[in-house]
């Protein structure tokens, strides 16, 4: 669809005569008839297949034609067509004399014709005017013409209809050839697909309007490139949604069980060495001079009873000093000036001469020790009780009184709150520092998994398109992890992939 435009510029008929040579009376009141038709090698009369148009009287004899885009005397003249412009044409322009006001062909005498010109040729669609001048013996006509496309028609022959739009059926303007030119932020055959925020993850993000990045289930962040870990994950990370991969030193389903108490809490004092011995469990190896579960107690050097033979120990800044009883000497009163004749063995110990009577040795009865059997045996000196247990002498034996949470001969065993299987319905028991925690199977809840709740949310296979279903243990709901190309809470929506 387009318009053939003809702009009449000047008509010269100096003598004011008709084509027959007869003069007009009083002058030639001139109007024009235009016939546009298909290309003919020799332009002949016949139907004006591309259209006709007539002007009112534009002047007398010789005159210039003003541009006029309004009223009946439109100039340029418009010859609209509703077909593909063929690129060729024939044009007939007739100048007529109007003796009266009726310009209809049937109202005019045939000899009222002033001049007739006919041209034909090629004409491409375009904005530029082609100027032409046709001269006969008595008249001259100067004019220009062009073909332009109607509004919303494009292309070399005005055959492509294109209307700019900005709604959900397209966001585009039209190029000169009629192809669509997408508005910024849109793409696709009809410019109906938004271009997401730059960097928005191809699989894990999508958008419904330009420069947006909406995350698929299981993903988060401005560009939807961060996975969402399992609900309740404490000291863990994920590489795919709903994972909980524990950080070093942590364990359990939610990575909330401390496997590296030594590093996280540094419980051992006074330079002691800490060893992890299980979940929230550790052992401190004390440096000399310290004791206690956490080596928090400073030992007196006299506590180890270094003075022998009844010597008394005195603490000093740089150690200790033994005050020996009569008959003994040495750093620890270990040397005796006595012999068996002096009856040095106490508590029924028997004396044996040594080195030809220069020395002796006592053989002590049970429960006594020391070079003179002067000490009652203390079976607790070696600190045999672990985990802060208290050592008690019981005659010839000893026993450990354990702190709560520990058992065994030497309090070496951690009492498990889980030992009595407190979690019902197959719940998994986790020992905590102050009690226990049950992780319940799907369908059960409560502190001990004693409450029956809804069945496994994934049991009904709610996820579509081969998505992976995860049950959220804390809410008894499911989450679908969609494969590439699908979105939606159940992965039910395919995504138009580029």
């Amino acid at each position: 669809s387009g318009v053939f435009q003809l702009q009449l510029q000047e008509f010269i008929n100096e003598r004011g005569v008709l084509a027959s040579g007869r003069p007009c009376e009083p002058g030639c009141r001139t109007f024009f008839r235009v016939c546009l038709k298909h290309f003919q090698a020799v332009v002949s009369p016949g139907p004006c297949t591309f259209g006709t148009v007539s002007t009112p009287v534009l002047g007398t004899n010789s005159f210039a034609v003003r541009d006029d885009s309004s009223g009946g005397g439109r100039n340029p003249l418009q010859l609209p067509f509703n077909f593909t412009w063929p690129g060729t044409f024939s044009l007939i322009i007739e100048a007529w004399h109007a003796p009266g006001d009726d310009l209809r062909p049937e109202a005019l005498p045939p000899d009222a014709l002033i001049s007739k010109i006919a041209i034909q040729g090629s004409l491409a669609v375009g904005q530029n005017w082609l100027l032409d001048e046709q001269t006969s013996t008595l008249t001259r006509l100067r004019y220009s013409y062009r073909v332009i496309c109607s509004d919303n028609y494009y292309g070399d022959n005005c055959s492509r209809l294109c209307k700019k739009r900005n709604d959900h059926f397209g966001h585009y303007v039209c190029q000169p050839d009629g192809n669509l030119s997408c508005l910024p932020g849109w793409t696709g055959e009809y410019c109906q697909q938004p271009i997401c925020l730059s960097g928005c993850h191809e699989q894990n993000g999508y958008c419904s309007k330009p420069a947006e990045c909406l995350c698929r289930p299981g993903w988060q962040g401005r560009l939807c490139n961060e996975c969402i870990p399992h609900n309740g994950c404490r000291h863990g990370t994920c590489s795919t949604p709903w994972q909980c991969t524990c950080d070093e030193g942590w364990g359990g389903l939610f990575c909330d069980q401390d496997l590296n108490y030594c590093t996280h809490h540094s419980p051992c004092k006074n330079g002691a060495t800490c060893s992890n011995s299980g979940q929230r469990s550790y052992t401190c190896t004390c440096r000399p001079g310290y004791t206690g579960v956490d080596c928090e107690l400073e030992l007196s050097e006299c506590d180890s009873n270094p003075c022998r033979n009844g010597g008394s120990c005195k603490d000093q800044e740089d150690g200790y000093h033994c005050l020996c009883p009569p008959g003994y000497y040495g750093l620890h009163c270990e040397h005796s000036t006595l012999s068996c004749a002096d009856s040095p063995c106490f508590n029924g110990g028997s004396c044996r001469e040594r080195n030809q009577g220069a020395n002796y040795a006592c053989e002590c009865p049970p429960n006594f020790t020391g070079s003179n059997c002067e000490k009652k045996v203390d079976r607790c000196t070696s600190n045999p009780c672990a985990n802060g247990g208290q050592c008690l002498n019981r005659g010839p034996s000893r026993m450990c009184r354990c702190r709560p949470g520990f058992t065994g001969t030497y309090c070496e065993l951690h009492v498990s709150d889980c030992a009595r299987n407190p979690c019902a319905h197959g719940g998994t028991c986790h020992d905590l520092e102050n009690g226990l925690m049950c992780t319940c199977p799907a369908g059960f809840s409560g502190r001990r998994c004693e409450v029956r709740t809804s069945i496994d949310a994934c049991a009904s296979s709610p996820c579509f398109n081969r998505a992976t279903c995860y049950t959220d243990l804390s809410t008894d709901t499911f989450v679908c992890n969609c494969p590439y190309g699908f979105v939606g809470s159940r992965c039910e929506f395919p995504v138009g992939l580029p």
Partner: antibody
Framework: EVQLVESGGGLVQPGRSLRLSCAVS??????????WGWIRQAPGKGLEWIGD???????YYNPSLKSRVTISVDTAKNSFYLQMNSLRAEDTAVYYC?????????????WGQGTLVTVSS | DYQLTQSPSSLSASVGDRVTITCSGQ??????ASWYQQKPGKSPKLVIY???KRPSGIPSRFSGSNSGDDATLTISSLQPEDVATYYC?????????FGQGTKVEIK
Amino acid sequence: EVQLVESGGGLVQPGRSLRLSCAVSGGSISSSSYYWGWIRQAPGKGLEWIGDIYYTGSTYYNPSLKSRVTISVDTAKNSFYLQMNSLRAEDTAVYYCARQALAMGGGSDKWGQGTLVTVSS
Amino acid sequence: DYQLTQSPSSLSASVGDRVTITCSGQRLGDKYASWYQQKPGKSPKLVIYEDSKRPSGIPSRFSGSNSGDDATLTISSLQPEDVATYYCQAWDRDTGVFGQGTKVEIK
């Protein structure tokens, strides 16, 4: 050949809700070339566009009905739906579902047979 | 709200007559117009889209045009099977708008 079949019509009391289904067969609702729309026609009256949806879930609604209408899609079932709340007598109409083609400037080239909804106590 | 007004609202013509229905709306020529035919008790059927294009199966006697504020549907030679109500439709931003319809009958 693509066919659209509506279901869910019938008698509804004023103030209640309605959910209509449109099952698409012979073609995929996930095609990027179409929007899927709902149009209604009150008895003896003209056509009124309600809204439409793209397979991705993007929706567009007639402003005069937007507050009461929700359109959804289930690509797995190759169906789309119209939920309408707070029904009143003037919502009595034949409800059509239709396929709107991008290649046809949004013209609806396929229509369902329609389902009658009567709102009355 | 954008409105489309069809004229006439009804017409009666003889078989073989040329029938023209007009649909008017502000700057309608800048939008794509569609035309639908609805026979009594039936669903609407698309007869013209994008102003002047015919879907496959629609007879060539149906034609359309659209410029300025008016779109027209022309049936060049009315046939008995063309008895129906005809609706124009266009999109205003993201909203579909229909004309009120023109009922075509045979004299």
